[in-house]
Interface confidence: medium
Amino acid sequence: QFLKEGQLAAGTCEIVTLDRDSSQPRRTIARQTVKCSCFPGQIAGTTRARPACVDARIIKTKQWCDMLPCLEGEGCDLLINRSGWTCTQPGGRIKTTTVS
């Protein structure tokens, strides 16, 4: 089966837009929009800091860390209001991701 131009293979994702704001010292805010073509029961999410198709139940229950959204060696920590997660690097630097 051939894919039309712009059509994604099932189970894959691509970044559509990526905006970075580095105007604040020691802080970079990035906003990313992705497009995914997921299998039934899956939904767009993040795995190992990259867009990915993940189990839809993870999104429904906001168990973000179950997507394994952080890089290997980083620690995932759910924000208590469940709006997202943090990834803590071994050196202590924290990257926060919020879902909207």
Epitope: K60, T61, K62, Q63, C65, D66, G75, C76, D77, L78, L79, I80, N81, R82, T86, T88, I94
Partner: antibody, heavy 122, light 110 residues
Framework: AVTLDESGGGLQTPGGALSLVCKAS????????MGWVRQAPGKGLEWVGV????????SYGSAVKGRATISRDNGQSTVRLQLNNLRAEDTGTYFC???????????????WGHGTEVIVSS | ALTQPSSVSANPGETVKITCSGG??????YGWYQQKSPSSAPLTVI????KRPSDIPSRFSGSKSGSTHTLTITGVQAEDEAVYFC??????????????FGAGTTLTVL
């Protein structure tokens, strides 16, 4: 075995402050969110608050919001509850609780401390 | 708030079901906590709907149907006599997600 050992309870005066400490052992402390639950004499369980793994994020129940501060020291495997402007209704047993997964809710507690009793009275 | 019966009773060997309904976060499921006396610490018998700590006997199980969760004790024993609290989360714009517990169900083994 997982153990959670609370300390710092006792007789407190209204308007004063208390500091409770929970010392954890038997698991990788920095990998779990932790919380505090209290129980007034003859009453049910009441959510006090929680803290995430790194200590950067906290949440509190409505009865203590604005008066409570939860902090943690992952190096010492301790979590602390500071409660200011004490009232008689803060009297009860305070339990330290461990979350079972990457977060703690009232549905995911898998271990409890033995509790420390707090009496607020003049 | 969570709703559970104030008391249930059973003979040894019988099956007991304690229900819990309400709460604002069914996706996160329910937990069940046993307290044998007012001065003792709670003990987790079920967390996250149906997970059982390794030291809890297999006669304790949890199940969910719609918005009602049920703790089942199959072949109840005298030592199961206790108060059982269910736990879930509720959401308010003021406090966000906050844990809530039922008022407790007293199980009497006759």
């Amino acid at each position: 075995a997982v153990t959670l050992d609370e300390s710092g309870g006792g007789l407190q005066t209204p308007g004063g402050a208390l500091s409770l400490v929970c010392k954890a052992s038997g698991f990788t402390f920095s990998s779990y969110q932790m919380g505090w639950v209290r129980q007034a004499p003859g009453k049910g369980l009441e959510w006090v608050g929680v803290i995430n793994k790194s200590g950067s994020d906290t949440s509190y129940g409505s009865a203590v919001k604005g008066r409570a501060t939860i902090s943690r020291d992952n190096g010492q495997s301790t979590v602390r509850l500071q409660l200011n402007n004490l009232r008689a209704e803060d009297t009860g047993t305070y339990f330290c609780a461990k979350g079972s997964a990457s977060y703690i809710t009232a549905a995911t507690i898998d271990a409890w401390g033995h509790g420390t009793e707090v009496i607020v009275s003049s | 708030a969570l709703t559970q019966p104030s008391s249930v009773s059973a003979n040894p060997g019988e099956t007991v079901k304690i229900t819990c309904s309400g709460g604002g976060s069914s996706g996160y499921g329910y937990g069940w906590y046993q307290q044998k006396s007012p001065s003792s610490a709670p003990l987790t018998v079920i967390y996250w709907n149906d997970k059982r700590p390794s030291d809890i006997p297999s006669r304790f199980s949890g199940s969910k149907s719609g918005s009602t969760h049920t703790l089942t004790i199959t072949g109840v024993q005298a030592e199961d006599e206790a108060v059982y609290f269910c736990g879930n989360d509720d959401y308010s714009s003021d406090s966000g997600y906050v844990g809530v517990f039922g008022a407790g169900t007293t199980l009497t083994v006759l």
